[in-house]
Each structure stands twice: as C-alpha cells, then as structure tokens.
C-alpha cells in the first residue's frame, strides 16, 4: 500500500479580520494509526494550534467529524480571526504510540490577514495662513493589513503630486499605519476648498476611505479697503466710509483716526457675505467740518484676525472744496475721541 | 535576495555588556529562526542562540545566563546581548538565518551575514 | 547536547581529483518523518561560511553538483567529485534536531 501523504491543498489562504479561516488538510491513508496535529510554523519553536487527540482549542473546530473512524479529513475553522494570526500552518499526522511520534508533514498553508484602514484623518496647519503661502495637510490611516495601499491627495476635486508618504513600520507587522504630508498652494478662493485624503486598500473592494478638511479652517484673506467721500449731506457736514473688502475669517475690529488720534473702534457684526466665502463690511464717519480750522486726516485702521493693522487715509480738505485722496499710512493710535464725529457701520 | 548586516562596537570592555544588532533586508522576517553564532580566533563555530518570528528563544545553556536575543520586526532588526564578557568572548560575531520547513528540526542555515570582529580587552 | 565528530581534520587536495570527509553524530539525526537533520557548511577564507547541503543530502541554492552529502542515523560524509581551487577552507557539519544547534570541529580543506 502507498504510504501516507498529509495533502495541504491551499498553499496561501487570506482572510478579513474576524472572519472565519478554513485550513484544509486531507490524508490519503487510515495508516498509520495516529492523530493529527496543526501547528503554526516549524522547528521547536512551532505553536500548537490543534491536537485531535486532546486538549482545549475554543476557537478551532473541525471541518467534518474527524473522531469517525473512517476520516481522512483534518481540515479545520479557526473563528474571530486577528492579524496576529498570520502565518504558516502545517497539518501534522502522529504516529500512535507511547509518546506518539511525527509521521509526515503537509506542506504548509500561509495564513495571510486583511484588516480595513481606520477613517483617514486630516489636520492642517496648527496657524491659518495667507493666499500664495504654501501649507501642509497630514493624513493618517492606522491598523491595516496587508502593508500595500494607496494615497491620494485631492484638492477641490482635482490631484495634488506634492506629497510624501510613509508606511510604517518598514519590516513585518500585524498591522501597518500610513501617514502622508501633502503641500497646498493657498489663492484668494480657497475658503470653500476641500482637501480631501483618499485611502485605496485591499479590503475596501475599490471604495476608498476619505478624509476631509475645510480650508476655511486653514486660510486667512486679508481684507482691502478703500476710504471714500461721500457727498455732503448737510451743510458743514461730510460722511466718509470705509469699505473693508474679501476678507475671512470675520473677525475683525475697525478704527477710525482723525489726525492720529482714535475717534472710534468698532467690531464687525453685519457683514455680506461674497460668492466666494470671503466677508465685505462698510463702516462710515459723519465729519462735522465746521469744527475744523485745518484740514483733516481721517485714517480707517482695521486689524484682522489678530494680524497687525492696516490702514487707508483720507485727507479731509477744510478750506476748499473735499476732494477724494487716499493712501495707506502706518496706523497711529492716541486713545483721543473727537466730538465733532460721528459714525455708523453697515 | 535576503542579506544580512551586524552593527556594533568592535572592543568592549571585560564585564562590561556586547550589544550587536543584525539588519535583515531584501526579505521576510516571518518563518525563520534568526540565529547568532560565533567563531574564537583560529577556532570553529559556536552557536549562541536563536529567535523565532514569534519571540519565543532558545540558547546555548552555557550562555543562557549572560545572553538575551530579541527581535524587532517592525525594523526587521534582531539584536543580541551578552553581559559580563571576558577574553574567552573574543570573536567574530555572525548573524544567520535560520530555515524550517515543517517539522521539529531546522533545515540549515542558509543566509550569514558578514561578521564582526568584536575584540574584549581593557 | 548532541557532539558532532569529524575527519579528518585535515584534507590535502588535488584538483580534478575526488575528495570525501566524515561527520559522526553522538545521536541519530534522523527524525521519525524520515527526514535527516544534518547540514554541510563550507567557509572560504576571511568569508562567512556557506550553506552547502541540507537534509543531509539536498544541496543548497546555488551549489554545485560536484557536492553531495549521503548518510543517515550517526554517520555522514560530504563527497566533492572533482575538486576546484575555490573549494579551499573549512567544511563543517552541523545538526540541527535540537537546540543547542552544535557543528563539528570542521575540516581544513587545502590543496596539496
């Protein structure tokens, strides 16, 4: 009769992460008597993973009745599957005596785990930053198994090549992280902009996993602004505005100097909002001119975001006719109030 | 193709601790043993001990109280450590891997790294 | 521990010409699946040793047929049909059933 052979048929079964695995492993003999064992790996340092003859095993069942005399079928389930049982699992048929001896071996099927990707999580720079400025976005994704996947960064729908990406650790792991650092151009429309992170693995079955962040928590526009001079609308009395344009975030604090000397502060409430996400804000002085011998230097300080102020300057003409001139100065700031102005935002 | 590098200081002190690491590249660290084994000037082969992928080790016994083996695989790295070293630890140093099929034995030791010298003197 | 005893411990050479060296194990290296723990190693001059045959009788990637090992239980012998220049240095045997893994005192190789 033919000797024995312990047939393995599967060299390599991968599996998802608490599924069930299936090792098959059939004999072609009921000679020699003996029981079967499975073990994960070779050499002394081999575990035991299953013994027919005794022991307790929760997580392994057999296949088909093993215990009926007639089997040759050893196959066996292992259940809640975990990356950390990857390996090599060989099928080992004993010899039975007093100990039982190693007859013959299969010749191994590698267990390989799949685990899905955590979401993609995306954060952006710790400070907001200015349109042409170039910011980092990173994005991580953890607990993964195998180690081959793929990132891309998108923009607005469109994919950025400025980025770098690192899959970790460099050896062998029950499972793997990722984490990529992408450049982002920031321009004047980006308020509505997504950056978006997209994770592409194996056991995602070509869904990928996305992460997102708004730029609107990443960008500052500086406002620009225009000082104007509106005409008279009584005698002896001017209104000039101050238009404070396409800025974001909306915090913003106005000052209104009248020769150095601060006449009012206010902060922006009302504002409009722009197609593109930016914010535009008006505020406006009632300069009595009459109370005026010399001519006036209306100055519109705004300071954005906690930046440092800007400013536009309007020279208020006493003695003639008011004509419209401005231009930007360094803000001064005396703490003085005039009561021969009068103001409004809007 | 799998290859091997040891790391480490060339002369130690006597009953000071050899710390030496080997570098796997080019391969798996899963089913292997990796084995350190070393050569006295002029003499022959000495193994030390090995680790299997699954942490468990297994040493010389005349060594087993001066001898730790670990294993990084997250840096496809194994290290070894030999404390209170005198004279007699003077040798060339080889990182090896070690194969297994099935069964309880092992089928050679099919990839050596290089070697480092590691001299023991004050 | 299983001693591994070689001979001779010393092997003039010609090339062309055929060469053989013993291995005695203090224990049978032969496992009950049949298969027989025994390694030939060679290491060339101021190199690493190398691989040559493992199982007792399966030559390693990359060697030479001119390399064959035979035995089984205690008693094993490394044959080289035809010597070259380059087989010069120390065959050793090695076992490798059980820990500690233990070689022979090895087997200077030199030609003649």
């Known amino acids: 009769e033919e000797e024995l052979q312990v047939i393995q048929p599967d060299k390599s079964v991968s599996v998802a992460a608490g599924e069930s695995a299936i090792l098959h492993c059939t004999v072609t003999s009921l000679i020699p008597v003996g029981p079967i064992q499975w073990f994960r790996g070779a050499g002394p340092a081999r575990e035991l993973i299953y013994n027919q003859k005794e022991g307790h095993f929760p997580r392994v069942t057999t296949v088909s009745e093993s215990t009926k005399r007639e089997n040759m079928d050893f196959s066996i389930s292992i259940s809640n599957i975990t990356p950390a049982d990857a390996g090599t699992y060989y099928c080992v048929k004993f010899r039975k005596g007093s100990p039982d001896t190693e007859f013959k071996s299969g010749a191994g099927t590698e267990l390989s785990v799949r685990a899905k990707p955590s979401a993609p999580v995306v954060s952006g720079p710790a400070a907001r930053a200015t349109p042409q400025h170039t910011v980092s976005f990173t994005c991580e994704s953890h607990g993964f198994s195998p180690r081959d996947i793929t990132l891309k960064w998108f923009k607005n729908g469109n994919e950025l090549s400025d980025f770098q990406t690192n899959v970790d650790p460099v050896g062998e792991s029950v499972s793997y992280s990722i984490h990529s650092t992408a450049k982002v151009v920031l321009t004047r429309e980006d308020v509505h902009s997504q950056v978006i992170c997209e994770v592409a693995h194996v056991t995602l079955q070509g869904d990928p996993l996305r992460g997102t962040a708004n730029l609107s928590e990443t960008i500052r526009v500086p406002p620009t602004l225009e000082v104007t001079q509106q005409p008279v609308r009584a005698e002896n009395q001017v209104n000039v505005t101050c238009q404070v344009r396409k800025f974001y975030p909306q915090r913003l604090q106005l000052t209104w100097l009248e020769n150095g000397n601060v006449s009012r502060t206010e902060t922006a409430s009302t504002v409009t909002e722009n197609k593109d996400g930016t914010y535009n804000w008006m505020s406006w002085l009632l300069v009595n001119v009459s109370a005026h011998r010399d001519d006036v230097k209306l100055t519109c300080q705004v300071e954005h975001d906690g930046q440092p102020a800007v400013s536009k300057s309007h020279d208020l003409k006493v003695s003639a006719h008011p004509k419209e001139q401005g231009s930007n100065t360094a803000a001064e700031n005396t703490g003085s109030n005039e009561r021969n102005i009068y103001g409004g935002s809007g | 193709q799998v290859q091997l590098q040891e790391s480490g200081p060339g002369l130690v002190k006597p009953s000071e601790t050899l710390s030496l690491t080997c570098t796997v590249s080019?391969?798996?660290?899963?089913?292997?043993?990796w084995s350190w084994i070393r050569q006295p000037p002029g003499k022959g082969l000495e193994w030390i001990g090995f680790?299997?992928?699954?942490?468990?080790?297994f040493y010389q016994s005349s060594l087993k109280s001066r001898v730790t083996i670990s294993l990084d695989t997250s840096k496809n790295q194994f290290s070894l450590k030999m404390t209170s070293v005198t004279a007699a630890d003077t040798a060339v140093y080889y990182c090896?891997?070690?194969?297994?099929?099935?069964?309880?034995?092992?089928?050679?030791?099919?990839?050596w790294g290089q070697g480092t010298t590691v001299t023991v003197s004050s | 521990d299983i001693v591994m005893t070689q001979s001779p411990l010393s092997l003039p050479v010609t090339p062309g010409e055929p060469a053989s060296i013993s291995c005695r194990s203090s224990?049978?290296?032969?496992?009950?699946?049949?298969?027989?723990?025994l390694d030939w190693y060679l290491q060339r001059p101021g190199q690493s040793p190398q691989l040559l045959i493992y199982?007792?009788?399966s030559r390693a990637s990359g060697v030479p047929d001119r390399f064959s090992g035979s035995g089984s239980g205690t008693d094993f012998t490394l044959k080289i049909s035809r010597v070259e220049a380059e087989d010069v240095g120390v065959f050793y045997c090695?076992?490798?059933?059980?820990?500690?893994?233990?070689f022979g005192q090895g087997t200077k190789v030199e030609i003649k």
């Open positions: 224990q049978s290296l032969l496992y009950s699946t049949g298969y027989t723990y």
């Open positions: 680790i299997y992928y699954n942490g468990r080790t």
């Open positions: 090695g076992q490798a059933l059980q820990t500690p893994l233990t």
């Open positions: 080019g391969g798996s660290i899963r089913d292997y043993y």
């Open positions: 199982g007792g009788s």
């Open positions: 090896a891997r070690v194969r297994a099929y099935s069964g309880i034995g092992l089928d050679g030791t099919d990839v």
